[in-house]
């Protein structure tokens, strides 16, 4: 016959935290390392599983199809209960009865999920919601891939996602000095760069690249490049295209300039010649299927031209340049230099030799163009 279990036989209650969908092992150890009778029950005293002879038997609980035990460890006095595919409602106090002792284990199951799709456009907000058992008071701390820390209770909000928020977020849920860690993969849909500037001499070929900061197996969308030339009063659509997986197909392209677009990712455009009339800035937008909003990348084109006309040597730049950029004309191997924080510099009656036109930013040369000035002989005076 079974002995009554006294209060002193009741071991201190352990707290175990579990993750929704995961597997948890609740341990229960007998003092003697041998196979003996044991039972696991829930707080309502409903039997979940136990031993009968040498066989595992299961009771009428809701856990019967998800609960198991490691039979191989029974003869070592270990009578753990394994619960698979954890649910929030599995949170309960579980009692292990062995050797006339009761071991209580409180299981608290938590779930952490993103409220929306985990593929979000740059600038959109991310909300993480914690599912927790009634009566619990957990705290949550999340760390972004970039090292940003955010704390909260049942919900955590990131108002404006940035490129560097892409990757695995690690969230720690704490309750009763115990912790459980969640990992959530967030993909921020954006271009690698928000803005880029291409510096070219007049006549050179121009390449614009728009690499994405993410990779997706299936990628469908459409895009357009609008261009605002410095010399033009209004912007113009240069190209429209479709995207399917890695395949890019041009829908419509302007006749001037004669742009060419690569037929596969990363998005890439080629302008046959850099000309002053093309200098300016563009905005490439990409709308992805099933996503609200668009991805944007700004691109700037700065064009340089060096010319000699009669006694005047001129260097000019067109396009978006910052006021701190310096434009200078200097004679190779000579000290002669003219510098200005302007978009044009010139030298009257330049000395013969190879002149360099330089566009620089704090000493760093962004663009240079060479022009040879030939000596001009004075015309002989007619007698």
């Amino acid at each position: 016959e079974q002995k009554l279990i006294s209060e002193e036989d009741l071991a201190a209650k352990k707290v175990v935290l579990g993750k929704k969908g995961d597997t948890v092992e609740l341990t229960c150890n007998a003092s003697q390392k041998k196979n003996t009778q044991f039972h696991w029950k829930n707080s309502n005293q409903i039997k979940i599983l136990g031993i009968q002879g040498l066989f595992l038997t299961k009771g009428p609980s809701k856990l019967s199809d998800r609960a198991d035990s490691r039979k191989s460890l029974w003869d070592q006095g270990c009578f753990s209960m394994i619960i698979k595919n954890l649910k929030i409602e599995d949170s309960d106090t579980y009692i292990c009865e062995v050797e006339n002792k009761k071991e209580e284990v409180e299981l608290l199951v938590f779930g952490l999920t993103a409220n929306s799709d985990t593929h979000l456009l740059e600038g959109q907000s991310l909300t993480l919601t914690l599912e927790s058992p009634p009566g619990s008071s957990p705290s949550v701390k999340c760390r972004s891939p970039g090292g940003k820390n955010i704390q909260g209770g049942r919900t955590i909000s990131v108002p404006q996602l940035e490129r560097q928020d892409s990757g695995t977020w690690t969230c720690t849920v704490s309750q009763d000095q115990k912790t459980v860690e969640f990992k959530i993969d967030i993909v921020v849909l954006a271009f690698q760069k928000a803005s880029s500037t291409v510096y070219k001499k007049e006549g050179e070929q121009v390449e614009f690249s728009f690499p994405l900061a993410f990779t997706l197996e299936k990628l469908t969308g459409s895009g357009e490049l609008w261009w605002q030339a410095e010399r033009a009063s209004s912007s113009k659509s240069w190209i429209t295209f479709d995207l399917k997986n890695k395949e890019v197909s041009v829908k419509r392209v302007t006749q001037d300039p004669k742009l060419q677009m690569g037929k596969k990712l990363p998005l890439h455009l080629t302008l046959p010649q850099a000309l002053p009339q093309y200098a300016g800035s563009g905005n490439l937008t990409l709308a992805l299927e099933a996503k609200t909003g668009k991805l944007h990348q700004e691109v700037n084109l700065v064009v340089m031209r060096a010319t000699q006309f009669q006694e005047n040597l001129t260097c000019e730049v067109w396009g978006p340049t910052s006021p701190k950029l310096t434009l200078s004309l200097k004679l190779e191997n000579k000290g002669a230099t003219v510098s200005k924080q302007a978009k044009a510099v010139w030298v009257l009656n330049p000395e013969a030799g190879m002149w360099q036109c330089l566009l620089s930013d704090s000493g760093q040369v962004l663009l240079e163009s060479n022009i040879k000035v030939v000596p001009t002989w004075p015309t002989p005076v007619q007698p």
Partner: antibody, heavy 118, light 107 residues
């Protein structure tokens, strides 16, 4: 094993028409870009036409635009090239080719010969 | 259309020689370039994609390099089975264009 088998070549008079077929096996036909490339006797390779499996978009070389039409029947795993207003210079071995995931022509058929002559 | 200029159009070499074939694009094509080998009466064989990526089963004596407009195919030590015609293909945009070919003959 990926296999491509062209058929439909033959002798045709200038101004005539011909339809080439390419039967594909060993891969998910509808997922890939398919192309036709030709080679005139003793000459180099000359891209003729491509068709996307994902979008159905078609692309043709300027030399055949308005005369040749590429099409596909994904249910039959077959690629076609409808050729009309044929000229002497269209005489060539016509190869069917499959693009890989990176959009390069990686697998080619053995070719079918088209001769345009009066 | 983008023009592809291949050089030389033919070359004579001996087994064990190092052979270099160049291909120049009329405009920048990133690294969207493939190399093909063709033997008489046979279909072309795909050797290299993305200018330098060797296809599986292609011997390591073949290598490719280049970006933008200038590309190179190198055979480090020519073997008897390498005597063939080699073509470059720009795969940057449609229309796709091949180089005119380089015939590698036995000296």
């Amino acid at each position: 094993e990926v296999q491509l088998l062209e058929s439909g070549g033959g002798l045709v008079q200038p101004g005539g028409s011909l339809r080439l077929s390419c039967s594909a096996s060993g891969f998910t036909f509808s997922d890939y870009v398919m192309s036709w490339v030709r080679q005139a006797p003793g000459k180099g390779l000359d891209w003729v036409s491509s068709i996307s499996g994902l979008t159905g978009n078609t692309y043709h070389a300027d030399s055949v635009k308005g005369r040749f039409t590429i099409s596909r029947d994904n249910s039959k795993n077959t690629l076609y090239l409808q050729m009309s207003s044929l000229r002497d210079e269209d005489t060539a071995v016509y190869y069917c080719a499959k693009d890989n995931e990176d959009y390069y022509m990686d697998v080619w058929g053995k070719g079918t010969t088209v001769t345009v002559s009066s | 259309a983008i023009q592809m200029t291949q050089s030389p159009s033919s070359l004579s070499a001996s087994v064990g020689d190092r052979v270099t074939i160049t291909c120049r694009a009329s405009q920048g094509i990133r690294n969207d370039l493939g190399w093909y080998q063709q033997k008489p009466g046979k279909a072309p064989k795909f050797l290299i994609s993305a200018a330098s990526s060797l296809q599986s089963g292609v011997p390591s004596r073949f290598s490719g390099s280049g970006y933008g407009t200038d590309f190179t195919l190198t055979i480090s030590s020519l073997q008897p089975e390498d005597f063939a015609t080699y073509y470059c293909l720009q795969d940057y945009t449609y229309p796709r264009t091949f180089g005119q070919g380089t015939k590698v003959e036995i000296k």
